[in-house]
Interface confidence: medium
């Protein structure tokens, strides 16, 4: 089956990211303006922004939410994110990409200094 481009949802838009901690970033977006009623799920894609050939991760979530916290990230790292809307037999174009960094890891207690 080939899904014609005019039948696909438009891309999710207004994607923005907010740093929550050293391992978590909150992503939020707006539903596609076109054919959003056909969307059954959203797919959040993310990868490290620095370096080459970074692995791309994907998590699929229901169509009943337009935000998601990714909580398995590395500290003090930059990540690039984008969202795709899925309909049963086709997907939207990618949303705009956004880049956001995680916080540095804070040690649980100050280092001991011996004099």
């Amino acid at each position: 089956t080939v899904v014609m481009s005019e039948d696909r949802p438009s891309a999710p838009y207004n994607v923005h990211a907010e740093t929550m901690s050293s391992s978590a970033i909150l992503l939020a977006w707006e539903r596609p303006l076109y054919n959003s009623d056909k969307v059954i799920a959203y797919s959040v894609h993310y990868m490290k922004a620095e370096g080459l050939n970074n692995e791309e991760y994907q998590v699929v979530i229901g169509n009943d939410t337009t935000h998601y916290i990714i909580d398995d990230l590395e500290p003090a790292s930059n990540y690039t994110f984008y969202i795709v809307a899925y309909m049963p037999m086709g997907a939207s174009q990618m949303s705009d990409h956004v880049t956001q960094n995680t916080l540095e890891d804070v040690p649980l207690r100050p280092p001991e200094i011996s004099l």
Partner: nanobody, 121 residues
Framework: EVQLVESGGGLVQPGGSLRLSCKAS????????MHWVRQAPGKGLEWIGG???????NYKSSLKSRVTISRDNSKNTLYLQMNSLRAEDTAVYYC???????????????WGQGTLVTVSS
């Protein structure tokens, strides 16, 4: 030949539970992002949840408390366990592979034929 075959549907009492199976052939379940999707009579498709290659699961928030997705790699089979069933859960349940978007935006991917679950006393 790539195939997904669901089983385990049928008539279930309200408040009961179900366990659906989805046997895959022609590809490896554990190296794909696999999903369960359902369609109630006269309604659109509803994504239930999925399990990725590393075994991490994710569920539609409204169903999260009642649903568990798992797999048996040795049997190349995906499972859906659903508890506290109600009449609104009556639907045809499908397993599916939603491909990474990098595979391209026009695709005909792998869907099973579906199994009907009727919740009624």
């Amino acid at each position: 030949e790539v195939q997904l075959v669901e089983s385990g549907g049928g008539l279930v009492q309200p408040g009961g539970s179900l366990r659906l199976s989805c046997k895959a052939s022609g590809f490896t379940v554990s190296s794909n992002y696999m999903h369960w999707v359902r369609q109630a009579p006269g309604k659109g498709l509803e994504w239930i949840g999925g399990i990725n290659h590393s075994g991490r699961t994710n569920y539609k928030s409204s169903l999260k408390s009642r649903v568990t997705i798992s797999r048996d790699n040795s049997k190349n089979t995906l499972y859906l366990q659903m508890n506290s069933l109600r009449a609104e859960d009556t639907a045809v349940y499908y397993c599916a592979r939603l491909p990474p978007s990098r595979d391209g935006y026009n695709y005909a991917d792998y869907w099973g034929q579906g199994t009907l679950v009727t919740v009624s006393s």
